[in-house]
């Protein structure tokens, strides 16, 4: 039961995380105009990965896409790439994890295959989360660097008379969405990896064979304690298969070719 819960929760957390990464990537507010000097602005600027926007106090908002590809800063291109890689890996991870879910039975899929798929999706979620966190962090670092550079050059005087105020940008909502979403995807991935350990068969359960020693009626079953517990007092949730018994959430053996659900 714990394995199913861990796997299911990991999937849900990752799903929320990836949805958040997609939302952050699409959001326009990666950087917003710093209003420290003038909190009452008639023109408010904010920028995303794909376009920059200007909101006027009339209520009108105008957004312009970055139609150039070569003219964009390398860092912005890197952030875009990291976020897209994160989304792609996350989406593939979600697809894989759907089939890996213990509560979903697909044909005669072996538990080892489910365990492998769970691990694969978990790793994908971890990498996806790391990509998102890295992308957002690179952008944040870029903002901090530019912020202090523009603060240093804030007022460039023309004969000391005219002030040209450079627009400074600070962290936008998308950065926080991205960090949280990346973190959730990472946590979800870790949970999937933990669930994988519970799904993976730790030994092969052979068919029980009785060896009759002379003068004794002792049944010998290979597999030691783990195997024998299948026949012990724990009879709850038993599913009898050809070659032994096991509970649904205990360490599972490979089903035989005759096992169908």
């Amino acid at each position: 039961m714990a394995v199913t819960a861990c796997q299911g929760l990991g999937f849900v957390v990752s799903l929320i995380g990836i949805a958040g990464i997609i939302a952050a990537t699409c959001m326009d507010q990666w950087s917003t105009q710093d209003l420290y000097n003038n909190p009452v602005t008639a023109v408010f600027n904010y920028q995303g990965l794909w376009r920059s926007c200007v909101r006027e106090s009339s209520g009108f908002t105008e957004c312009r896409g970055y139609f150039t590809l070569l003219g964009l800063p390398a860092m912005l291109q890197a952030v875009r790439a990291l976020m897209i890689v994160g989304i792609v890996l996350g989406a593939i991870g979600l697809l894989v994890s759907i089939f890996a879910l213990k509560c979903i039975r697909i044909g005669s899929m072996e538990d080892s295959a489910k365990a492998n798929m769970t691990l694969t999706s978990g790793i994908m979620f971890i990498v996806s989360g790391l990509c998102a966190i890295a992308g957002v962090s690179v952008f944040a670092n870029m903002l901090v660097t530019n912020f202090w550079m523009s603060t240093a050059n804030m007022y460039t005087g023309m004969g000391g008379m005219v002030q040209t105020v450079q627009t400074r940008y600070t962290f936008g909502a998308a950065l926080f969405v991205g960090w949280v979403a990346g973190g959730l995807t990472l946590i979800g991935g870790v949970m999937m990896c933990i669930a994988c350990r519970g799904l993976a068969p730790e030994e092969t359960n052979y068919k029980a064979v009785s060896y009759h020693a002379s003068g004794h009626s002792v049944a010998y079953k290979p597999g030691g304690f783990k195997a024998s517990t299948g026949f012990g007092s724990n009879t709850k949730n038993k599913k009898i298969y050809d070659g032994g018994a096991r509970t649904e959430d205990e360490v599972q053996s490979y089903p035989s070719k005759h096992d169908y659900v």
Partner: antibody, heavy 120, light 113 residues
């Protein structure tokens, strides 16, 4: 046809109060940000206050902050300016204006104005 | 606050003449986000409210004759009337639309010779 009609003019003693109204017609009032602008007897134009279309953003000129209150009733298509603690320097012609929906923060329509005189 | 300085304070012209008036701001009105200059020009005739002529420093309001042209960027702006007509006699104000408080210039009065 866009129409802005101000009302509430009067002669007030210093320290007194007055409420100006601006009735809007000919456009979707709730979609536009509005402003009050005054013109002094010396013909200087001074921006007084701003209110966003939904009334959630409000800005004032430093000279009137804490004394004047801008508000709007979108159901009645009316803009208001509540003036209190009036000073002689508040004597002016008060215009209500509509901010152009697209194009900076330019005021594309103005009312005919209402006169406010603060004198003892 | 952004200070708007207009010059000259008055202009005496003859009909058909080309006129230019200047407006300078104490801070740049150019917004880096969209590369637009947030400066507006208004015309005010005696006994009337101001009328919008030009916004974004150079965009003519609909219905405004094409003899009116706005130009300039950053801190220096110009309003040009290519051929003055009798109905153009008025006071012209420039306004900072970039930051609150929105500030107006002192105006340039256009008079007929």
């Amino acid at each position: 046809d866009v129409k802005l009609v101000e009302s509430g003019e009067g002669l007030v003693k210093p320290g007194g109060s007055l409420k100006l109204s601006c009735a809007a017609a000919g456009f979707t009032f709730s979609s536009y940000a509005m402003s009050w602008v005054r013109q002094t007897p010396e013909k200087r134009l001074e921006w007084v206050a701003y209110i966003s279309s939904g009334g959630d953003y409000i800005y004032y000129a430093d000279t009137v902050k804490g004394r004047f209150t801008i508000s709007r009733d979108n159901a009645r298509n009316t803009l208001y300016l509540q003036m209190s603690s009036l000073k002689s320097e508040d004597t002016a012609m008060y215009y209500c204006s509509r901010l152009r929906l697209r194009g900076g923060n330019a005021m594309d329509y103005w009312g005919q104005g209402t006169s406010v005189t603060v004198s003892s | 606050d952004i200070v708007m300085t207009q010059s000259p304070s008055s202009l005496t012209v003859t009909a058909g003449e080309k006129v230019t008036m200047s407006c300078k701001s104490s801070q740049s009105l150019l917004n880096s986000g969209n590369q637009k200059n947030y400066l507006t020009w208004y015309q005010q005739k005696p006994g009337q409210p101001p009328k919008l002529l030009i916004y974004w420093a150079s965009t003519r309001e609909s219905g405004v004759p094409d003899r009116f042209t706005g130009s300039g960027s950053g801190t220096d702006f110009t309003l040009t009337i290519s051929s003055v007509q009798a109905e153009d006699l008025a006071v012209y104000y420039c306004q900072n639309d970039y930051a609150y408080p929105l500030t107006f210039g002192t105006g340039t009065k256009l008079e007929l010779k």
